[in-house]
């Protein structure tokens, strides 16, 4: 038997993926475990193999269908179970009734690009990936810019309280290398959380013209 504290957390990307992490203090090290998803309104079910991500936590992705297919809706409830092999049988280690649209975490924004750059400002755009049509415009974004000599953690957060897939960064230093990241969150869902940060976009401001004030 496994003793200790267990935590089983899953998020739906709003289309066709449920990502789960299972943590167990004093967990079995060499045991095969999986997550099984059983929607109560659907004819399909899905399984993924839990793989170690640290000493006492495992993760896996339930791929429900084609990336942009709408496999679950606001009224679906999915029974999620962690099953671990014990000899010839499977033992239920954790179970939850999962409401997908109460537990959302979207994919990181993609296709970041510099639309226009000047000496002191830069206009950047991006796209959201695999986001449900249910949200319409009910999304918000956070962005951050990495300045030379600073860390991401020190970067101030810029909040966009609407579905706005661009930003104009102001008061930048001329001829300076920056990096930019953005993340997205639906307004819907009691346990919804921010997406991962996008891949950083590197850009450089234009040098100040000679003889001009900066």
């Amino acid at each position: 038997a496994v003793n200790g504290t267990s935590q089983f957390t899953c998020f739906y990307n709003s289309r066709a993926n449920i990502s789960c992490v299972w943590s167990q203090d004093g967990a079995l090290q060499d045991t095969s475990c999986q997550v099984h998803a059983w929607p109560d309104r659907r004819r399909w079910n899905q399984t993924c193999e839990l793989l170690p991500v640290s000493q006492a936590s495992w993760a896996c992705n339930l791929i429900l269908g084609a990336p942009d297919s709408q496999k679950l809706t606001t009224v679906d409830i999915v029974t999620l179970r962690v099953l671990c092999r014990e000899g010839v049988r499977w033992r239920v280690m954790a179970i939850q009734d999962f409401k997908p649209f109460e537990n959302l975490r979207l994919m990181a924004p993609i296709s970041l690009q510099v639309v226009h750059v000047e000496t002191h400002r830069c206009n950047i755009s991006w796209e959201i990936s695999q986001a449900s049509h249910y949200f319409e415009r009910h999304l918000e974004f956070e962005a951050r810019t990495l300045s030379p000599g600073h860390t991401w953690e020190e970067a101030p957060l810029l909040t966009l309280k609407q579905k706005q897939e661009w930003i104009c960064l102001e008061t930048l230093t001329p001829d300076t290398q920056y990096e930019f990241q953005v993340r997205v969150k639906p307004l819907q869902g009691e346990f919804t959380t921010w997406s991962p940060w996008s891949q950083p976009l590197a850009f450089r401001t234009k040098p100040a013209a000679l003889g001009k004030d900066t």
Partner: antibody, heavy 112, light 107 residues
Framework: EVQLVQSGGGLVQPGGSLRLSCAAS????????MSWVRQAPGKGLEWVSA????????HYADSVKGRFTISRDNSKNTLYLQMNSLRAEDTAVYYC?????WGQGTLVTVSS | DIQLTQSPSSLSASVGDRVTITCRAS??????LNWYQQKPGKAPKALIY???NLETGVPSRFSGSGSGTDFTLTIISLQPEDFATYFC?????????FGQGTKVEFK
């Protein structure tokens, strides 16, 4: 073999009440959401209500909201529909259903 | 609510004919569309689930296709026992909604 066996239909006066039952067998009842669907004489099908597998979530058609209550007893593998304040327009054959399996239907007649 | 528009409302056919019935949804329902056969005084019988999957025990002359908003039920060679009413159901989201039905009659 999957079976959904219905009972509880009959003749009732307007304003009256009736409770329909649907006994399930041949599948893991608690793993499936269940619905009630009705069909008025000579008409098409109309969804009435649904309940999640655990019973914790319910949904109703606007036409029955506040009058009908869906419930389930997973220990008895049984689905229920409590119908109150019945009207003439509720007259229909009522089916308990999942998309794959339907009960045999039970006739509810609301008439004075 | 999602509307399902089924056509034709009726058709006349002979044994051995190929029959095609269509169902169009007012918005995308992914692949969550089911087809049923109903005979007078009987409960509906499931034929196809999730747009294209044949229910257990249903003859292979029945097939379904489509996704998003446009769906088709095809009977490749109509048999005497196939004369009935057919309808589609979306179970993508509540409320479930149904097509108006297609009555397949003897020519």
């Amino acid at each position: 073999e999957v079976q959904l066996v219905q009972s509880g239909g009959g003749l009732v006066q307007p304003g009256g009440s009736l409770r329909l039952s649907c006994a399930a067998s041949g599948f893991t009842f608690s793993s499936y959401a269940m619905s009630w669907v009705r069909q008025a004489p000579g008409k098409g099908l109309e969804w009435v209500s649904a309940i999640s597998g655990s019973g914790g979530s319910t949904h109703y058609a606007d036409s029955v909201k506040g009058r009908f209550t869906i419930s389930r007893d997973n220990s008895k593998n049984t689905l229920y529909l409590q119908m109150n304040s019945l009207r003439a327009e509720d007259t229909a054959v009522y089916y308990c259903a999942t998309p794959a399996f339907w009960g045999q239907g039970t006739l509810v007649t609301v008439s004075s | 609510d999602i509307q399902l528009t089924q056509s034709p409302s009726s058709l006349s056919a002979s044994v051995g004919d190929r029959v095609t019935i269509t169902c169009r949804a007012s918005q995308s329902i992914s692949s969550y569309l089911n087809w049923y056969q109903q005979k007078p005084g009987k409960a509906p019988k499931a034929l196809i689930y999730d747009a294209s999957n044949l229910e257990t025990g249903v003859p292979s002359r029945f097939s379904g296709s489509g996704s998003g908003t446009d769906f088709t039920l095809t009977i490749i060679s109509l048999q005497p026992e196939d004369f009935a009413t057919y309808f589609c159901l979306q179970d993508y989201i509540y409320p479930w909604t149904f097509g108006q039905g297609t009555k397949v009659e003897f020519k």
